[in-house]
Interface confidence: low
């Protein structure tokens, strides 16, 4: 079957990183410079994605295979494929159109990048506030006050709501 | 020790010109890649431009672009940034920095300069 479809179609023959160049009976030619197929049988290849600006180069651009890019530090990706790059925030902040700003009292954001959420309500839990919450850092809830009372038995200190100045990337 | 020095910042009117000298030590200064960044008063990290160890890849940030002009001499261990037609919103914090090639498929700046002051204002 791959005989008889490639006698239909002399392009099928031709491999990633070449086109099939009509102006050259179809022969299969080499992709041109800062251009790519991924595929073969292509009647053209693509230009190759520049990483410029606050773009940088992650992966060259091959023969068979587009440039990939990320962001300078200080910025980080957004989008499919990098398609764009967001200002990095400190911790306890957010990005807005008017740049970072200070997380909200009552809320907090452990991360350099999205938004500020609120503080854990621990009452909605029957629980109270161990540890406070900051601009960076979720408040740690803890056993409830009745659990605390005098006489109550013995209480295990709660777990941290996250590794303390662990923030994910 | 990797060392990189700026020089060259100060107070320019609109419109004037500033050449910042990058020196470098420490290191096999032609093996690897060199940008510009700056900061402005307020804002974030922005990225100038950058130029190839041998100096033949060259690219700018578009806010640049027609203005400035970054170039190298490998043998003096020297980066510099001619700004020419200079606006007040190019007033920054300048710094050099050299990209580590030791990692690979990353960005990482691995040194970066202290920085030189320009400022354009009438």
């Known amino acids: 079957f791959e005989r008889t479809r490639s006698l239909q179609d002399p392009c099928s023959n031709c491999p990633a990183g070449t086109f099939c160049d009509n102006n050259r009976n179809q022969i299969c030619s080499p992709c041109p410079p800062n251009s790519f197929s991924s595929a073969g049988g292509q009647r053209t290849c693509d230009i190759c994605r520049q990483c410029k600006g606050v773009f940088r180069t992650r992966k060259e651009c091959s023969s068979t295979s587009n440039a990939e890019c990320d962001c300078t530090p200080g910025f980080h990706c957004l989008g499919a494929g990098c398609s764009m790059c967001e200002q990095d925030c400190k911790q306890g902040q957010e990005l807005t159109k008017k740049g970072c700003k200070d997380c909200c009292f009552g809320t907090f954001n452990d991360q350099k990048r999205g938004i500020c959420r609120p503080w854990t309500n621990c009452s909605l839990d029957g629980k109270s506030v161990l540890v406070n919450g900051t601009k960076e850092r979720d408040v740690v809830c803890g056993p409830s006050p009745a659990d605390l009372s005098p006489g109550a038995s013995s209480v295990t200190p709660p777990a941290p709501a996250r590794e303390p100045g662990h923030s994910p990337q | 020790e990797v060392q990189l020095v700026e020089s060259g910042g100060g107070l320019v009117q609109p419109g004037g010109s500033l050449r910042l000298s990058c020196a470098a030590s420490?290191?096999?200064?032609?093996?690897?890649?060199m940008s510009w960044f700056r900061q402005a008063p307020g804002k974030g990290l922005e990225w100038v431009s950058h130029i190839s160890g041998s100096g033949t890849t060259i690219d700018y940030a578009d806010s640049v672009k027609d203005r400035f002009t970054i170039s190298r001499d490998n043998a003096r261990n020297s980066l510099y940034l001619q700004m020419n037609s200079l606006r007040a919103e190019d007033t920054a914090v300048y710094y050099c920095?050299?990209?580590?090639?030791?990692?690979?498929?990353?960005?990482?700046?691995?040194?970066w300069g202290q920085g030189t002051l320009v400022t354009v204002s009438s």
């Open positions: 420490g290191f096999a200064f032609s093996d690897y890649y």
């Open positions: 920095a050299r990209e580590d090639i030791r990692m690979p498929g990353t960005t990482d700046f691995d040194h």
